[in-house]
């Protein structure tokens, strides 16, 4: 995915008192945007 | 590789818990929003529940039909997230499915029945 | 919650031909910085699910641009421009804009 999913705040609005945001972030913090961003940690040697 | 591989999956009686363990390793897993999601035996798919990253507090999110009963948690040091399931109902019986919406993992099944 | 109905519920094509699926919501899909929260996924038999357009007409990483999105605010379109063999299984649409976030019932695609 070039912009993979958007999480952003579909949905702070169960809490009570708290906005509706209507915003969907998924994307920017999805799996494949990670990926993108973040270099994988060497995996550990034996 | 992306890999998220589901464990803990079995067959309970209702009223009883399990704890199901979504293991990830391929990608830098701290900011990365999660979720469970299942699929009931007539194919539909429910969201059930969802966590965010340290950065949004780990705030949680969940499905009317698991609320109060379902919890999610995730360990970053482990790159790992969990579904601990308790008061288990006959209708919980599904494949649960640990995801991030642009990879899944394979499934785990759990069965509720007496 | 916002209920997303899906049309038809299974279609038979032929290979080669083109074939759409429709997904309604009850509400409106388009969040703040004009983005649409709808988003289309395949099942595949015996496999899990795979994302394959996101916000409305974004194509998936390695999915082929036979798949196309499109919509309004609250009717969406999946096209399928040419069938191919492995494109059976079900399409579900889905929405993660408001929670608790819901997917449609899915449409089962099979070929003539």
């Known amino acids: 995915l070039a912009d993979p999913l958007d999480h952003r705040d579909a949905g702070d609005l169960w809490v009570p008192g708290e906005s509706e945001s209507f915003e969907d972030a998924h994307v920017e913090h999805s799996i494949s945007r990670s990926l993108l961003e973040g270099e994988i940690p060497f995996p550990p040697t034996s | 590789e992306v890999q998220l591989v589901e464990t803990g999956g079995s067959l309970v009686q209702p009223g009883k818990s399990l704890k199901l363990t979504c293991a990830t390793s391929?990608?830098?897993?701290?900011?990365?929003?999660m979720h469970w999601v299942r699929q009931s035996p007539e194919k539909q798919l429910e969201w059930i529940a969802h966590?965010?990253?340290?950065?949004?507090?780990?705030?949680?999110y969940y499905a009317e039909s698991v609320k109060g009963r379902f919890t999610i948690s995730r360990d970053d040091s482990k790159t790992s997230i969990y579904l601990q399931m308790n008061s288990l109902k006959d209708d919980d019986t599904a494949i649960y499915y640990c995801?991030?919406?642009?990879?899944w993992g394979q499934g785990v099944m759990v069965t509720v029945s007496s | 919650d916002t209920v997303l109905t899906q049309a038809p519920l299974s279609v038979s094509v032929t290979p080669g031909e083109s074939a759409s699926i429709s997904c309604r919501s009850n509400k409106s899909l388009l969040g703040i910085r004009d983005i649409t929260s709808l988003y289309w996924f395949l099942q595949k038999p015996g496999k899990s699910p795979q994302l394959l357009i996101y916000?409305?007409?974004n194509l998936a990483s390695g999915v082929p641009d036979r798949f196309s999105g499109s919509g309004s605010e609250t009717d969406f379109t999946l096209k399928i421009s040419e069938v191919e063999t492995e494109d059976v299984g079900v399409y579900y649409c889905a929405q993660f804009l408001r929670y608790p976030y819901t997917f449609g019932p899915g449409t089962k695609l099979e070929l003539q």
């Open positions: 966590i965010k990253a340290k950065s949004d507090n780990y705030a949680t």
């Open positions: 916000r409305m007409s």
């Open positions: 995801t991030g919406l642009d990879y």
């Open positions: 391929g990608f830098p897993f701290s900011n990365v929003w």
